[in-house]
């Protein structure tokens, strides 16, 4: 769902926190069209997925808290 | 205490549709996921999908869509699950389940089940 | 999809003894698995989360291990009230497909 670094739209899986090692946010005022959290996996891929549903903003809040504590 | 009441049974007719209830009690119904699960006779477990109460949001089974639509009315705290275009195959308990995060997308209370069998 | 695989289907032992019931998955799920008993008769209640934590009200007896692709579920010291049906489910990505289940009982 990414092109030339910009999401066109996002996955339809719900991934585990496990799974994820970071995530970049794009925003569609910079360029892309849609607003999209870009996950990024242990298997060196990228995820593109919805800011809005609630398992995002759990992964991203997990995921800001981990490194405010580094 | 957290509960997940569901009917015990429905009989329903080949080709009918059914709409099964699951009303949740006793925890902040849109703060967690709620998962539908099929188990037929003697077979193992089937996950069908999930809702997320706070946002409708859903996910199916790629095996289920067409087949199961999940619903939710936030008012009643109840969730639903709507089977369509009913055969043999779809006799089975359906159970409701709470996924929650804090214990690693688990489900950690379930309904009862409701006991579909389809037949003429 | 992840395929489950576990084994064995089904299992015999004796009150006392110490069993275990192992779950492959298709690739690597990172630990992102769970454990389920089921009783005749009954809904089934979430035994073992995230792979070695132990769920609330289930006894310490029942223990998990394992990472990557293989997993494991140990119960010791067996008691006749274990008699169930266990599935193990991996919830790294949807569709969160189930294990086919071992079925215990006691010699």
């Known amino acids: 769902a990414s092109n030339f670094d910009c999401c066109l739209g996002y996955t339809d899986r719900i991934l585990h926190p496990k799974f994820i090692v970071g995530f970049t946010r794009q925003l569609a005022n910079e360029g892309c069209d849609i607003n999209a959290i870009i996950f990024h996996t242990k298997k060196k891929l990228s995820v593109c997925a919805n800011p809005k549903q609630t398992w995002v903003k759990y992964i991203v809040r997990l995921l800001s808290k981990k490194v405010k504590n580094m | 205490q957290v509960q997940l009441q569901q009917p015990g049974a429905e009989l329903v007719k080949p080709g009918a549709s059914v709409k099964m209830s699951c009303k949740a009690s006793g925890y902040t119904f849109t703060s967690y996921w709620m998962h539908w699960v099929k188990q037929r006779p003697g077979q193992g477990l089937e996950w069908i999908g999930l809702?997320?109460?706070?946002?409708?949001?859903?996910n199916y089974n790629q095996k289920f869509k067409g087949k199961a639509t999940l619903t939710v009315d936030t008012s009643s705290s109840t969730a639903y699950m709507q089977l369509s275009s009913l055969t043999s195959e779809d006799s089975a308990v359906y159970y409701c389940?709470?996924?929650?995060?804090?214990?690693?997308?688990?489900?950690?209370?379930w309904g009862q089940g409701t006991s579909v069998t389809v037949s003429s | 999809d992840i395929q489950m695989t576990q084994s064995p289907a089904s299992l015999s032992a004796s009150v006392g003894e110490t069993v275990t019931i192992t779950c492959g998955a298709s690739e690597n799920i990172y630990g992102a698995l769970n454990w389920y008993q089921r009783k005749q008769g009954k809904s089934p209640q979430l035994l073992i989360y995230?792979?070695?934590n132990l769920a609330d009200g289930m006894s310490s007896r029942f223990s998990g291990s394992g990472s990557g692709r293989q997993y494991s579920l140990k119960i010791s010291s067996l008691h006749p009230d274990d008699v169930a049906t266990y599935y193990c489910?991996?919830?790294?990505?949807?569709?969160?497909?189930f294990g086919g289940g071992t079925k215990l009982e006691i010699k």
């Open positions: 995230g792979a070695t």
């Open positions: 809702i997320d109460p706070s946002d409708k949001y859903t």
């Open positions: 489910q991996n919830v790294l990505s949807t569709p969160y497909t």
């Open positions: 389940t709470r996924g929650n995060y804090g214990v690693d997308y688990g489900m950690d209370y």
